[in-house]
Amino acid sequence: ILGGREAEAHARPYMASVQVNGEHLCGGVLVAEQWVLSAAHCLEDAADGKVQVLLGAHSLSQPEPSKRLYDVLRAVPHPDSRPDTIDHDLLLLQLSEKATLGPAVRPLPWQRVDRDVEPGTLCDVAGWGIVSHAGRRPDRLQHVLLPVLDRATCNRRTHHDGAITQRMMCAESNRRDSCKGDSGGPLVCGGVLEGVVTSGSRVCGNRKKPGIYTRVASYAAWIDSVLA
């Protein structure tokens, strides 16, 4: 997260760290007791690593009573995701067992009504992604509030030049932005999950390159079919 600040510890109990071989790779969001939603591209570089999900964490390194690492039983990428586009960039991870819920571990309701969030709405994005262009990684969860940007502006030739589909949304990126390592994490508007950070190699913090988020409401049928 660029231009953000440290989050209040455990105030986002839905927040997940998707890890490979014990290292944070991407964000994720607990959407059901046994399921974490993330971005499909996240695991492309997981190769043959051990994929696990950390729940109940604020610090990645320090012991915390609520922290627990879960093995992944199943990784279900969206069937239309592919390596060279950010379309359909969603991944569902089934935990090896139901998460132990509590004040620091709780699923987040996700948007089912397929309607665009009003431009200008302030939404919260959180993650353990880099906090500087130099690539510094935080140990503790960071967050930032970002205004939603209308799709027409986001699709301008000077911005994303028509790449933003109806199934994506944008948020402003003027020095405050999600960045490498935040992919798969939640964009939360009014206490509801609206978007998932896409995992392209976009430049961060440049206002001409807004943050791109996959709209979960557009994938309600797929999410329901996997969780069923």
């Epitope: 499909a40 570089d45 997981a46 190769a47 043959d48 051990k50 039983l73 199943r74 990784a75 069937p79």
Partner: antibody, heavy 120, light 112 residues
Framework: EVQLVESGGGLVQPKGSLKLSCAAS????????MNWVRQAPGKGLEWVAR??????????YYADSVKDRFTISRDDSESMVYLQMNNLKTEDTAMYYC???????????WGTGTTVTVSS | DVLMTQTPLSLPVSLGDQASISCRSS???????????LEWYLQKPGQSPKLLIY???NRFSGVPDRFSGSGSGTDFTLKISRMEAEDLGVYYC?????????FGGGTKLEIK
């Protein structure tokens, strides 16, 4: 640039041995599973062996046709994968490819191959 | 072992025409993780094979959208909507759901 370069092929007599090597570069070798796939002259592709990464205990898997004769191994410090072939048979004559194994897909990067000829 | 049977063995196609290759597995190739690891590879003359399609229908990086994969259970199809000269070669289906992994026998695409 992601690259796999095989070496060690050659002519060997039946019941002989040969060790193939594959040098990997341009990617984090230690996190990937690696495979050997072969192709007999004028024939189709046949998967031979797979070795997983350290996080999966370097588990190995083999085709029935080579089990107990071939051994796949790796050296993560040198980004190398090997195929030790013992008790070779004429039907092992083939082009041997070293192949990287992805997460969502299997064989995403192939070497150019090394030729093994088993003949008396 | 899972036997992968490809048809036809050889397919003469005119440039610009559609080509369709079938692949049938001797048993279901749905993996225990729920995914179906059915892939298609193209080997051009004198070259190493290249991945075209993974998980039945997903095009790999740089693969033109004239290539499409479909199917489920034990029956799978690769379609090339408009045959181009660069598409010539041998196409192989592959299953990675059950060890030992197995390839189909190959289908040679030729110009009619």
């Amino acid at each position: 640039e992601v690259q796999l370069v095989e070496s060690g092929g050659g002519l060997v007599q039946p019941k002989g041995s040969l060790k193939l090597s594959c040098a990997a570069s341009g990617f984090s070798f230690n996190t990937y599973a690696m495979n050997w796939v072969r192709q007999a002259p004028g024939k189709g592709l046949e998967w031979v062996a797979r070795i997983r990464s350290k996080s999966n205990n370097y588990a190995t898997y083999y085709a029935d046709s080579v089990k107990d004769r071939f051994t796949i191994s790796r050296d993560d410090s040198e980004s190398m994968v090997y195929l030790q072939m013992n008790n070779l048979k004429t039907e092992d004559t083939a082009m041997y490819y070293c192949v990287r194994h992805g997460y969502y897909w299997y064989f995403d990067v192939w070497g150019t191959g090394t030729t093994v000829t088993v003949s008396s | 072992d899972v036997l992968m049977t490809q048809t036809p063995l050889s397919l003469p196609v005119s440039l610009g025409d559609q080509a369709s290759i079938s692949c049938r597995s001797s048993q279901s190739i749905v993996h225990s993780d729920g995914n179906t690891y059915l892939e298609w590879y193209l080997q051009k003359p004198g070259q190493s094979p290249k991945l075209l399609i993974y998980r039945v229908s997903n095009r790999f990086s740089g693969v033109p959208d004239r290539f499409s994969g479909s199917g489920s259970g034990t029956d799978f199809t690769l379609k090339i909507s408009r045959m181009e000269a660069e598409d010539l070669g041998v196409y192989y289906c592959f299953q990675g759901s059950h060890v030992p992994y197995t390839f189909g026998g190959g289908t040679k695409l030729e110009i009619k």
